[in-house]
Interface confidence: low
């Protein structure tokens, strides 16, 4: 297993609809054709896996049907979008990239993107 550098933004604020997007960029040492991207969340000293996708270079990322993540790839960049976020989902979201094929296998883990989620205030009752 060889190490690889992964860069991602330090902070992202989710939209009022609970959607957060960020770019995960990896320094590919070779011509990878198969890449696996995993988003991890770290909060309260617990790490969880949010979503994962394997894709062939140049193709769309395919997450599981019930995943809260979507994404697109462009060269060595992956544009990730996480949906359905609530205030309780605030935390450090870490991008993990694996170059699966061809060998050798490379692994890179970013420093994480702190995603802040603020639940929208309910609209006050109004006669208008």
């Amino acid at each position: 297993c060889k190490a690889m550098h992964v860069a991602q933004p330090a902070v992202v604020l989710a939209s009022s609809r609970g959607i957060a997007s960020f770019v995960c960029e990896y320094a590919s040492p070779g011509k990878a054709t198969e890449v696996r991207v995993t988003v991890l969340r770290q909060a309260d000293s617990q790490v969880t896996e949010v979503c994962a996708a394997t894709y062939m270079m140049g193709n769309e990322l395919t997450f599981l049907d019930d995943s809260i993540c979507t994404g697109t790839s462009s060269g060595n960049q992956v544009n990730l979008t996480i949906q359905g976020l609530r205030a309780m989902d605030t935390g450090l979201y870490i991008c993990k990239v694996e170059l699966m094929y061809p060998p050798p296998y490379y692994l890179g883990i970013g420093n994480g993107t702190q995603i802040y989620v603020i639940d929208p205030e309910p609209c006050p009752d109004s006669d208008f």
Partner: nanobody
């Protein structure tokens, strides 16, 4: 309904290896986090290791870190625990369990909804 059946236990000498398997039936098993727990004679059941739904994330108890490896094959609905450098204190009944969430790797029993019957691992010379 999820059913879990463990296998692979047995008698092994200290320093030896064993590979436990847990065959799962039911869709929930392959789409949720899974874990291994163990219960030594006269002791409470304790967390050993857990793995996320896609296998991308794992967690281990400090006592087994570097010796045990958890993995899963969702195409076969099977969870594995490779145990190396076994010690006498690893003697226990090993249980596999299915968590109620996809991604969260919990360390406490009450976070797991389905349990197998267990397989006995005895480490002795």
């Amino acid at each position: 309904e999820v059913q879990l059946v463990e296998s692979g236990g047995g008698l092994v000498q200290p320093g030896g290896s064993l590979r436990l398997s847990c065959a799962a039936s039911g869709r929930t098993a392959s789409s949720n986090a899974m874990a291994w727990f163990r219960q030594a004679p006269g002791k409470e059941r304790e967390f050993v290791s857990a793995i996320s739904a896609t296998g991308g994330l794992t967690a281990y108890a400090d006592s087994v870190k570097g010796r045990f490896t958890i993995s899963r094959d969702n195409s076969k609905n099977t969870l594995y625990l490779q145990m190396n450098s076994l010690r006498a204190e690893d003697t226990a009944v090993y249980y596999c369990a299915v968590g109620r969430e996809r991604w969260y790797l919990r360390h406490t029993e009450n976070e797991y909804d389905y349990w197998g019957q267990g397989t006995l691992v005895t480490v002795s010379s």
